[in-house]
């Protein structure tokens, strides 16, 4: 906390500017209006401050809106972001887009903070679900985004959202993700033809029923060893020996290499042997 | 953790020349800002001179303009501070200061401080 002590004379600021990089704590906590700076805070970030300089300027916007920042003030935040605190950011109401662009800027390339995850929160409740224009935001500065929302949270999700995401982005998902996602993606992608389907499903498999992986094995859809050992196990364990082979088409041959690791493991000992030697893979139920 | 360290300090004649040095154990091409600040005994800490690298603007206190030169070296990540015809009220401890962007370094808005360097001017 800046001890609070009287503008010397002839330093009163008039407007925020650079020659307040010049001004020690103190002074700037004397000398510059706090409503000043929230209508001039699109100019803090251009001038050179030192974040200490930065925590001072938070202190008098704190002053200023003790019940929270209005957005006019947030969106023009930038650095100054990385100075709030979770609790800070709770008394916020973030509504727009673009503020949210602007300060995810200021995170960007690095991890998701408690401050930014928080900044998210409050935005997605305040919208009521998420779009997939704030889906797209979102996934763009955090590929992982989607799979760090709970099965509950995904529920809120709107089909017409699943367009924005790319196959990146459900890397880290866990199967119970998948099951509340995969219904979503077959609804939105339910227009397309055989084979651009595949392309766009594909990353949402590991949460499809069996009777859907028997209707792609129909559609000569090549399924790679990859995608084929994030199914589940519950949905592939009752295929038919004929049906994983047209599901895999060519890649069938990989089988071998993956027949100790689930979901090939446990499937294999479910088939016939006769069955499993018409593959000519040598795998052993 | 960024580590900086000044040299160059020292004893010296009004009028005078020194070069400070501050070597940075990280990258500072990738600073937001860097600064050299100077404190004299029993006085407050000023800002001396000022690099902000996203617009490569430099910023110096009415007290050393014309006087004193701020620059960096990416290369070998060192700040520097070129003071001429210096004067007896330069006496102090020299600070360089480095602000990262939040991405580098953790994430964490903070501004890296070094040890300092003490410049005294006296005939």
């Known amino acids: 906390e800046v001890e609070k002590t009287a503008c010397p004379s002839g330093k009163k600021a008039r407007e925020i500017d650079e020659s307040l990089i010049f001004y020690k704590k103190w002074e700037l906590e004397a000398c510059v209006d706090a409503a000043l700076l929230a209508t001039q805070m699109d100019r803090v970030n251009a001038i050179p401050f030192t974040y200490e300089q930065l925590d001072v300027l938070k202190h008098k916007l704190d002053e200023l809106y003790p019940q929270g920042y209005p957005e006019s003030v947030i969106q023009h935040l930038g650095y100054l972001f990385l100075k709030m605190s979770p609790e800070d950011i709770r008394k916020w109401n973030v509504t727009s887009l673009e503020t949210l662009k602007a300060l995810l800027e200021v995170n960007k390339g690095h991890e998701m903070s408690p401050q930014v995850a928080t900044l998210i929160d409050r935005f997605v409740k305040g919208r009521g679900q998420l779009d997939k224009d704030t889906l797209d935001t979102l996934t763009a500065f955090y590929p992982g985004y989607l799979c760090s929302l709970s099965p509950e949270e995904l529920s809120s999700v709107p089909p017409s959202s699943i367009w924005a995401v790319r196959p990146q982005d459900l890397d880290t998902c866990d199967p119970r993700q998948l099951d509340v996602l995969y219904p979503k993606a077959r609804l939105a992608f339910q227009n397309m033809n055989g084979s651009e389907y595949f392309v766009k499903i594909q990353s949402f498999l590991g949460g499809a029923p069996t009777e859907d992986l028997k209707a792609l094995s129909q559609q000569n859809v090549s399924m790679d060893l990859a995608t084929f050992m994030k199914l589940r196990t519950d949905a592939v364990l009752p295929l038919t020996v004929a049906e994983v082979q047209k599901l895999l088409g060519p890649h069938v041959e990989g089988l071998k290499a993956e027949e100790r690791h689930r979901p090939v493991r446990d499937w294999i000992l479910r088939q016939r042997q006769d069955d499993l030697d018409t593959l000519g893979l040598g795998l052993q139920g | 953790q960024v580590q900086l360290v000044e040299s160059g300090g020292g004893v010296v004649q009004p009028g005078r020349s020194l070069r400070l040095s501050c070597a940075a154990s990280?990258?500072?091409?990738?600073?937001?800002?860097m600064h050299w600040f100077r404190q004299a005994p029993g006085k407050e800490r000023e800002l001396v001179a000022t690099?902000?690298?996203?617009?490569?603007?430099?910023y110096y206190a009415d007290s050393v303009k014309g006087r004193f030169t701020i620059s960096r070296d990416n290369s070998k990540n060192t700040l520097y501070l070129q003071m001429n015809s210096l004067r007896a009220e330069d006496t102090a401890v020299y600070y360089c200061a480095v602000s990262y962007y939040p991405n580098e370094y953790d994430g964490v808005p903070y501004d890296y401080w070094g040890q300092g360097t003490l410049v005294t001017v006296s005939s």
């Open positions: 990280g990258t500072i091409s990738t600073a937001r800002t």
């Open positions: 690099i902000s690298t996203g617009t490569n603007t430099y």
